[in-house]
């Protein structure tokens, strides 16, 4: 596929981590600067649902 | 089950290409970025490139930058890393690896969650 | 682009010890930092994430902390199996940088 080129480095101006307005299964990345699939967010401490933060769950699946 | 795959690798003269490919699977690459990550021998982890596939955003490191060129084709559901003008600081270890986000009030919090096995890239002549 | 200084380059302790690995980012990267562990011929896995998050199917001897441009690793009790390489990564700036590593060898 053709690619366009995200010069990333020459836009660190601090409003480059403002995230944008995403869809509900995505969230802002400000690495690559964009929207990208999102899964739900999990308190550390207990692996419950926090009543602080909207969108959190469980810990996510196990990695290889 | 997620899984990312290498192949591509082997020895190459100075100057020479190659282009490595990451078959992935258990997820679908349009939905995250795909990282490019080298060790040379005795080293510690490099940042080679990553992409974008839903936008075709790409970033490299300087190290890289006008030599390699990373892509990916959402149809294969792989990633590709081509490599080109070889020099002997190049040998490494090439690993892919999913960029993972979770929801954090709307922001990505998230790591590199699952990588491949790592391909051998050795520049030589 | 942002550094990220890792220390101790390497350590040696045993089992049961208390491990604290610092990383230290030359700007604000707020709580974008992820740690890893890495053993000789396998690919790295995935510890801690947004600076203190533990990722899942992770020892919770394993912690995180920090915020800025000062972050911390523990083990809070050293097991045979921690022997490792670990690394620290930004991502909240483009491009991701790891710190050098930090081995952890037995005393």
């Known amino acids: 596929m053709g690619a366009r080129r995200l010069r990333v480095r020459s836009q660190r101006s601090r409003d480059s981590s403002v995230p944008t307005q995403c869809n509900q299964t995505e969230c802002f990345d400000p690495l690559v600067r964009n929207c990208v699939s999102c899964e739900l967010f999990h308190t550390p401490d207990t692996g419950h649902t926090s009543s602080l933060e909207p969108g959190t769950a469980l810990q996510p699946q196990e990695g290889s | 089950e997620v899984q990312l795959v290498e192949s591509g690798g082997g020895l190459v003269q100075p100057g020479g290409s190659l282009r490595l490919s990451c078959a992935a699977s258990g997820f679908t690459i349009s939905s995250s970025s795909i990282h490019w990550v080298r060790q040379a021998p005795g080293k510690g982890l490099e940042w080679v490139a990553w992409v974008l596939p839903s936008v075709g955003f790409t970033d490299y490191a300087d190290s890289v930058k006008g030599r390699f060129t990373i892509s990916a084709d959402t149809s294969k559901n792989t990633a590709y890393l081509q490599m080109n003008s070889l020099r002997a600081e190049d040998t490494a270890v090439y690993y892919c690896?999913?960029?993972?986000?979770?929801?954090?009030?709307?922001?990505?919090?998230?790591?590199?969650?699952?990588w491949g096995q790592g391909t051998l890239v050795t520049v030589s002549s | 682009d942002i550094q990220m200084t890792q220390s101790p380059s390497s350590l040696s302790a045993s089992v049961g010890d208390r491990v604290t690995i610092t990383c230290r980012a030359s700007e604000d990267i707020s709580t974008a930092v992820a740690w890893y562990q890495q053993k000789p011929g396998k690919a790295p896995k995935l510890l801690i994430y947004?600076?203190?998050f533990l990722y899942s199917g992770v020892p919770s001897r394993f912690s995180g902390s920090g915020s800025g441009t000062d972050f911390t690793l523990t083990i809070s009790s050293l097991q045979p199996e921690d022997f490792a390489t670990y690394y620290c990564q930004q991502s909240q700036i483009s491009p991701p940088t790891f710190g050098q590593g930090t081995k952890v060898e037995i005393k």
């Open positions: 690896a999913r960029r993972v986000c979770y929801n954090r009030l709307g922001v990505c919090a998230g790591g590199m969650d699952y």
């Open positions: 947004a600076a203190s």
